[in-house]
């Protein structure tokens, strides 16, 4: 007899995830020579762990701390770029400038990043047919605890100016509810941060408004100003020179406002 | 079984650019990182750069920093390395390589290499 | 970036005698892991290198037992106990503590 199987509203775990764990966690280890100390057989038993025969509305940060302390990793708190519905180009920023780091360029964000996963009560499977979606289903799932671990201990880390990119072409540009929004930016350590530095991203060729005035950005400023967080914000109104001018800060065309 | 094989030989002009396949199969493409060596007739073994197929991230040599560029195709389990600008000492047989797994640990030794690409670069 | 120093450039050795090659690098290859990241490589004629030896003295799948490496943390050797026709060809050290890799400049190895 078939065994009953709850139906989630969202998509399964994604295919090869024990493989896929594994692989990405020897590949970082690889290329950032200082995480060699990792030994990424008990990462994946302590990723395992913290899913695995739960119910996967009922995850807690506590199921992850295991992981946690094995995933701890120190990046330069100055040079943390924080990003919100705009994660390809901060990554292709970090990919260039290579002393500054996203959450995805540190191991725990790296094993993770587009991947899903959940378990079920009382049984050691992975279940790939579906998983709880965060808003049709339940917050507490395995993907989103993970992700809101680790963004507040990301941001707990950082210090001095702390950069956020932010997609200036939604109708939100700042979301309370993103993660940035309802995490990261309630977790910037006011002892340690001076100021957070805003990159408002332009999608079109010829938007030339100041999107540092948009309303949601001014409730951002008003957020962080009552943290005692400084507040600025940049106009980047041409994403593709901003990125070429980062590789070749010294072209004569970088001079200008990008 | 496991195998990076190489495009053939090239022959190209002082300044112009080469662009060389390596071809992944026998296992999952995106699963390891791919290296680029290459060797100068008689000279010894150069590390060029790498590329994480998974995410297309890539690092290089400084030496190499602004002539080199690694992608890859992932639908194809394909790496490229192109290299612009020849000049005469770019003449040299190139390789791509990958590191072995031992017990979920990265063996730091390239332990699989393409079969080598000569790219002879004349005036 | 590390550099790599191997001893000597070559090596005329009889078949059924030991061979001996050194290598040294400009730091120490020890990691705070406990491994020590020094390979060594022997290419043949027309062929790519091939890996004997990783982690300093852990042999590589299929290499011979007459192959060992040793040493410390920026001193190695690779030891060949009896030296066959096959093992003709030229040996690379590598260093894999950091990146940019490294190799040494080769040691050539011949048959008397």
């Known amino acids: 007899v078939p065994r009953w199987r709850q139906q989630w509203s969202g998509p399964g775990t994604t295919k090869r995830f024990p493989e896929t764990v594994l692989a990405r966690c020897v590949k970082y280890t690889e290329i950032h020579p200082e995480m060699r100390h990792v030994d990424c057989q008990s990462v994946w038993d302590a990723f395992k762990g913290a899913f695995i025969s739960k119910h996967p509305c009922n995850i807690t940060e506590e199921d992850y701390q295991p992981l946690m302390k094995l995933g701890t990793q120190t990046v330069p708190c100055n040079k943390i770029l924080l990003w919100s519905r705009i994660k390809d180009l901060a990554h292709q920023f970090t990919q260039v400038q290579r002393d500054m780091f996203t959450l995805e360029d540190t191991l725990l964000g790296y094993l993770a990043d587009d991947l899903t996963w959940c378990g079920e009560f009382n049984t050691s499977k992975i279940n790939y047919q579906s998983c709880p979606d965060w808003r049709k289903d339940c917050s507490n799932n395995p993907v989103s605890v993970f992700w809101k671990t680790v963004s507040r201990r990301f941001a707990e880390a950082a210090c001095d100016v702390v950069h956020v990119m932010l997609n200036g072409s939604r109708s939100k540009i700042f979301d309370k509810n993103s993660t940035f929004g309802s995490v990261e930016v309630h977790n910037l350590q006011p002892e340690k941060v001076q100021t957070l530095e805003a990159w408002v991203i332009h999608g079109g060729r010829e938007d030339s408004r100041d999107l540092c005035q948009d309303p949601t950005i001014k409730e951002l400023e008003s957020i962080i100003s009552k943290r005692n967080i400084q507040f600025s914000c940049k106009n980047i109104y041409r994403p593709d020179k901003f990125l070429q001018c980062v590789k070749n800060p010294e072209d004569s065309s970088c001079t200008s406002e990008i | 079984q496991m195998q990076l094989v190489q495009s053939g030989a090239e022959v190209k002009k002082t300044g112009s650019s080469v662009k060389v396949s390596c071809k992944a199969s026998?296992?999952?493409?995106?699963?390891?990182?791919m290296h680029w060596v290459r060797q100068a007739p008689g000279q010894a073994l150069e590390w060029m750069g790498w590329?994480?197929?998974?995410?297309?991230?890539?690092d290089y040599a400084q030496k190499f920093q602004d002539r080199v560029t690694i992608t890859r195709d992932r639908s194809m389990s394909t790496a490229y390395m192109e290299l612009s600008s020849l000049r005469s000492e770019d003449t040299a047989m190139y390789y791509c390589a990958r590191v072995a797994i031992i017990t979920t640990v990265a063996s730091g030794g390239f332990a699989y290499w393409g079969q080598g690409t000569l790219v002879t670069v004349s005036s | 970036d590390i550099v790599m120093t191997q001893t000597p450039l070559s090596l005329s050795v009889t078949p059924g005698q030991p061979a001996s090659i050194s290598c040294q690098s400009s730091e120490s290859l020890l990691h705070s892991n406990g491994k020590t990241y020094l390979n060594w490589y022997l290419q043949k004629p027309g062929q790519p290198p091939q890996l004997l030896i990783y982690w300093m003295s852990t042999r590589a799948a299929g290499v011979p037992d007459r192959f060992s490496g040793s040493g410390s943390g920026t001193d190695f050797t690779l030891k060949i106990s009896r030296v066959e026709a096959e093992d003709v060809g030229v040996y690379y050290c590598q260093q894999f503590l950091e990146y940019p890799p490294t190799f040494g400049q080769g040691t050539k190895l011949e048959i008397k």
């Open positions: 026998g296992y999952t493409f995106t699963d390891y990182i």
């Open positions: 590329i994480d197929p998974e995410y297309g991230s890539t």
